[in-house]
Amino acid sequence: EVEKTACPSGKKAPEIDESLIFYKKWELEACVDAALLATQMDRVNAIPFTYEQLDVLKHKLDELYPQGYPESVIQHLGYLFLKMSPEDIRKWNVTSLETLKALLEVNKGHEMSPQVATLIDRFVKGRGQLDKDTLDTLTAFYPGYLCSLSPEELSSVPPSSIWAVRPQDLDTCDPRQLDVLYPKARLAFQNMNGSEYFVKIQSFLGGAPTEDLKALSQQNVSMDLATFMKLRTDAVLPLTVAEVQKLLGPHVEGLKAEERHRPVRDWILRQRQDDLDTLGLGLQG
């Protein structure tokens, strides 16, 4: 807590500028008007204030806005955002995607801080759901964001948001997460034609049931082995040799290299040897 002292004569700040870096903490407290600071927040980031000086500026804003900062101030917090506590952020009502982007930019390239985690939770709750634009923004800064949500949380993601998901956003998802995301993707991409549909749905196929894999096998999709290896074992097991051959197309030869790995191993064991022999790969059931 900075002690209340009168501002020395001639030191009252008419605006937020570089001259303030020479002010002692008590002078900043006494000579900078909080309302002026609020209207000129965008200037603070261009000035090399010390952490101690930033603490004073934050204190002034806290006094001016005890119920939480307005969005016009929040949007221009810049590095002052790093001084906020999760408790401070819980008082905010951030509704603009531009504000969210501005604050995420401050933390860019770093692990999600408690401040950012709280901000995102507040923002998403305020929007009511994880809409496409929000998801687009979050995955741009945090590619693993989607895979950091529980299956229960993912169940509230609307199918329309799936359009924002890039293949790399699903890299760290586990099978249970894909189980939730796949039906949403199927719904989101349902009006696309065969080859375009496959390109979009491919990353989500780790959650696909047997009947959908059977349907894909009729569409000349030529699934690569990397995708096939990520399919649910229980979804692959009922597929016939002919269906797997159609599903993989020219990539079917890759089964030999993967014959000891799931789901290929388990699938081979379910097939009749005569059927496996039709592939000419020397697979032994």
Partner: nanobody, 115 residues
């Protein structure tokens, strides 16, 4: 930088139990998912179980009902309680910590189940 250290592996008879631990050091905030994977000799690494930021859990079909994943936030540790172990559970078990930005792996701990 996050470091993960697994422990608790060993040799156990079929039907027996083991409890694996994974201690995380370094700072991670925000949403964290802790997962266990395993890799048997000559096989691909496969997912075993997850515990999400919300506390909810999920399991792969082969271990459902036999394994339980839990965590102690105060100790920054995640556990895998493995009951009714089978020879097919023999593998190196790896702990994974997933954040919204990165994925970190431990060195693994060997579990051998003899018949």
């Amino acid at each position: 930088q996050v470091q993960l250290v697994e422990s608790g592996g060993g040799l156990v008879q079929a039907g027996g139990s083991l409890r694996l631990s994974c201690a995380a050091s370094g700072s991670t905030f925000g949403r964290i998912v802790m997962r266990w994977y395993r890799q048997a000799q000559g096989k691909q690494r496969e997912w075993v179980a997850s515990i999400y930021d919300s506390g909810s859990t999920s399991y792969s079909d082969p271990v459902q009902g036999r394994f339980t994943i839990s965590r102690d936030n105060a100790r920054n540790t995640v556990y895998l309680q493995m009951n009714s172990l089978r020879p097919a559970d023999t593998a190196v078990y790896y702990c994974n910590l997933g954040t919204a930005l990165s994925s970190y792996w431990g060195q693994g701990t060997q579990v051998t189940v003899s018949s």
